[in-house]
Interface confidence: low
């Protein structure tokens, strides 16, 4: 027959290879049925029998067809400081990630080996970088004109308010306090985030102020109504 | 015990490439950022730049043309290297250990290394 | 870039004297921070957040102001305290020091 409708085991041409979902087994030198995910090879094949799958046992798994001899166990239950994103099946590992207000700190293939709590911000700092799956927050001092007043593991430096009459002027972790009724928010650009200095990960030629309702950018010149061009020498 | 140490010291001539690696111990690169600070002869301390706890890195607008700031968390090494140097590059490189969410101070440091910059 | 201006640049001091000495900023920050170095030694952190000592610095340490005027002040010079002092701003881009304060003793 030819090896496109030949039936399982069959020997392979010179020089060919077996098909989709099939396998060479070395030893009866023929083309063989892989098993499918979720089972495994419970008996594998002869010159003149085919692969015999079984189904895998409670906690093991197997994700992709194959034709190992026992399924892979699940992974360990998730500690306390992860949620189990997807759970063990026979066809897939169990898979931990970290709880919210968290970050992975030590990554395996799949979730998280090692979580950790995202480090907070105590007043007068604000997030610089904002936490993801994978990183800790980082904090920069509030830059003059700003505040934080909160200790977060989200909160960025914000402006001061402006007052008409200043009662009690502001610092970097606390607000301007005002006499009058009508306060209003500094506007000036890149306020809201603490100037540093130029990053790489910058898309920029040269940096420039992030828009503000992107409160995770903080690649910024110092706050100010005309941040200087790269390379300038003034104040 | 938490320590830094720079490779070196090192000789370099005009217009080569100068590379140090800071390797750290006591401490893991994936919870603190460590700076790179010079100190020329008889002079005071200049800052170059930072790479941070996440990899990030962001440099002094005077050496961002030259200067690339690395690391190898799992080994706990950071690598330096500036380009084109000069013999007004000529100083004592020190990297610094900071924590991105603590006091903010540079508050361990390496011995530092010479770089003499001379055809 | 944010200038700042130590004085004096070098000033010496009798064991027991009260010393001072000044890092103005060309224009506001928030915190300083100050370093001390001795010859052939790194520098260290010696306060920080403007007015906290690092650990292990005498109390007769104490730093202070806001704005663009900080100051370092030794209530008691002693010997040891002989070295040179740095300040220290990342309140804009890029963070800098002063050029420093040699201290001397008497």
């Known amino acids: 027959l030819p090896a496109q409708v030949a039936f399982t085991p069959y020997a392979p041409e010179p020089g060919g290879t077996c098909r989709l979902r099939e396998y060479y087994d070395q030893t009866a030198q023929m083309c063989c049925s892989k098993c499918p995910p979720g089972q495994h090879a419970k008996v594998f094949c002869t010159k003149t029998s085919d692969t015999v799958c079984d189904s895998c046992e409670d906690s093991t798994y197997t994700q992709l067809w194959n034709w190992v001899p026992e399924c892979l166990s699940c992974g360990s239950r998730c500690s306390s400081d992860q949620v189990e994103t997807q759970a063990c099946t026979r066809e897939q590992n169990r898979i931990c990630t970290c709880r919210p207000g968290w970050y992975c700190a030590l990554s395996k293939q799949e979730g998280c080996r090692l979580c950790a709590q995202l480090r907070k911000c105590r007043p007068g700092f604000g997030v610089a970088r904002p936490g993801t799956e994978t990183s800790d927050v980082v904090c920069k001092p509030c830059a003059p004109g700003t505040f934080s007043n909160t200790t977060s593991s989200t909160d960025i430096c914000r402006p001061h308010q402006i007052c008409h009459v200043v009662a009690i002027p502001g610092n970097a972790s606390m607000d301007a306090v005002c006499t009058s009724t009508s306060p209003t928010r500094s506007m000036a650009p890149g306020a809201v985030h603490l100037p540093q200095p130029v990053s790489t990960r910058s898309q920029h030629t040269q940096p420039t102020p992030a828009p503000s309702t992107a409160p995770g950018t903080s690649f910024l010149l110092p706050v100010g109504p005309s941040p200087p061009a790269e390379g300038s020498t003034g104040d | 015990e938490v320590q830094l140490q720079e490779s070196g010291p090192v000789l370099v001539q005009p217009s080569q490439s100068l590379s140090i690696t800071c390797t750290v111990s006591?401490?893991?690169?994936?919870?603190?950022?460590v700076h790179w600070v010079r100190q020329s002869p008889g002079k005071g301390l200049e800052w170059l730049g930072v790479?941070?706890?996440?990899?990030?890195?962001d440099y002094s607008a005077a050496f961002i043309s030259r200067l690339s700031i690395s690391k190898d968390n799992s080994k706990s090494q950071v690598f330096f290297k500036m380009n084109s140097l000069q013999a007004d590059d000529t100083a004592i490189y020190y990297c610094a250990r900071n924590d991105d969410g603590g006091d903010y101070a540079m508050d361990y440091w390496g011995q530092g290394t010479t770089v003499t910059v001379s055809s | 870039e944010i200038v700042l201006t130590q004085s004096p640049a070098l000033m010496s001091a009798s064991p027991g004297e009260k010393v001072t000495m000044t890092c103005s900023a060309s224009s506001s920050v928030s915190y300083m921070y100050w370093y001390q170095q001795k010859p052939r030694s790194s520098p260290k952190p010696w306060i920080y957040l403007t007015s906290n000592l690092a650990s292990g610095v005498p109390a007769r340490f104490s730093g202070s102001g806001s704005g663009t005027s900080y100051s370092l002040t030794i209530s008691s010079m002693e010997a040891e305290d002989a070295a040179t002092y740095y300040c220290q701003q990342w309140s804009s881009n890029p963070l800098t020091f002063g050029a420093g304060t040699k201290l001397e003793i008497k």
């Open positions: 790479i941070w706890s996440d990899g990030g890195t």
């Open positions: 006591g401490f893991s690169l994936t919870s603190y950022s």
